[in-house]
């Protein structure tokens, strides 16, 4: 059996100051159980952007229905973007446990803010 | 405060048809994925069917699979059942479950008694 | 199916441990509190150890591996109940439920 693995298509996305910025991310199994959740940045400085398990995130919405059973498809959408949003994103899978721990990584997507148009 | 009132129980004769309504107030309804659970008179718990958020996609326990039909209208904010070919073992409490995150149940409705009875 | 035991009993103020077993690692379990047959449950601790924010601090859970431990601290009379153990599996889609455990408080 083939291990789950986080794809991110996109290397980079820009996005006009003001508008949304849709980020593309798939695992390849559902197992091993546990949540998705999104980060700007790496390392232990890195900002929790989403959590599929808790947590309230009123810009981010997710883009497929992710209460089907057999969803694998945790791309999200961030409202209202702004130059303070430009870095790098990355959708990380963790496996339950106590705590949930990391397990795999995707390749991340750059997000750069262009002005709004006039 | 999140309430689910199930109502449509009743004393039914084996063979027939019966729809079962869930009405949900104190939550987003149509952010959540819902279940039906029944209980047989001095039995445990049994799950019976699943819908996702939007109502695309349901999910059946093999012993309703092909004589139940599971469906919500997000606009009544109500989750249905509809059972046919009834038989002596669907006799049960019937519950809505407001699923979480991980298709586990957080609330509870009080229970609507489907009866067979020739 | 979810195995766990059919009754567990103990004094006032003891800690009580009911587990549940079979699910696998693709699952994660939850707990429900049923006081009297056919009233309705009681979610006590979903996602393994996440307990509802109307639930006593007395209540927990855990998991580990295929298996899935609620644990009552300091019991009260009032804990009387059936305490069933359920289960998400992510290779089937499909709930299941223990058979249910009576706790008695002498």
């Known amino acids: 059996e083939e291990e789950l693995q986080v794809i991110q298509p996109d290397k980079s996305v820009s996005v006009a100051a003001g508008e949304s910025a849709i980020l593309h991310c798939t695992v390849t199994s559902l197992i091993p159980v546990g949540p998705i959740q999104w980060f700007r940045g790496a390392g232990p400085a890195r900002e929790l952007i989403y959590n599929q398990k808790e947590g309230h995130f009123p810009r981010v919405t997710t883009v497929s229905e992710s209460t089907k059973r057999e969803n694998m498809d945790f791309s999200i959408s961030i409202s209202n973007i702004t130059p303070a949003d430009a870095g790098t994103y990355y959708c990380v899978k963790f496996r339950k446990g106590s705590p949930d721990t990391e397990f795999k990584s995707g390749a991340g997507t750059e997000l750069s803010v262009r002005a709004k148009p006039s | 405060d999140v309430q689910l009132v199930e109502s449509g129980g009743a004393v039914v004769r084996p063979g027939e048809t019966l729809r079962l309504s869930c009405t949900a107030s104190?939550?987003?309804?149509?952010?959540?994925?819902m279940s039906w659970v029944r209980q047989a008179p001095g039995k445990g718990l049994e799950w019976v069917s699943g819908i996702s958020a939007s109502g695309s996609d349901t999910y059946y326990a093999d012993s309703v699979k092909g004589r139940s039909t599971i469906s919500r209208d997000n606009s009544k904010n109500t989750l249905y059942l509809r059972m046919s070919s009834l038989t002596a073992e669907d006799t049960a409490v019937y519950y809505c479950?407001?699923?979480?995150?991980?298709?586990?149940?957080?609330?509870w409705g009080l229970g609507t008694l489907v009866t067979l009875s020739s | 199916a979810l195995t766990q035991p059919a009754s567990v009993s103990a004094n006032p103020g003891e800690t009580v441990k009911i587990t549940c077993s079979g699910g696998g690692t693709s699952s994660y379990y939850g707990w429900y509190q049923q006081k009297s047959p056919g009233s309705a449950p009681v979610t006590l601790i979903?996602?393994?150890?996440k307990r509802p924010s109307d639930i006593p601090s007395r209540f927990s859970g855990s998991a580990s591996g295929s298996t899935a431990t609620l644990t009552i601290t300091g019991v009260q009379a009032e804990d009387e109940a059936v305490y069933y153990c359920g289960g998400y599996d992510y290779t089937t889609y499909v709930n299941t439920f223990g058979a249910g455990t009576t706790l008695t408080v002498l």
């Open positions: 979903h996602s393994d150890d």
């Open positions: 479950a407001r699923e979480t995150w991980n298709h586990l149940f957080d609330y």
């Open positions: 104190g939550f987003t309804f149509s952010s959540y994925a």
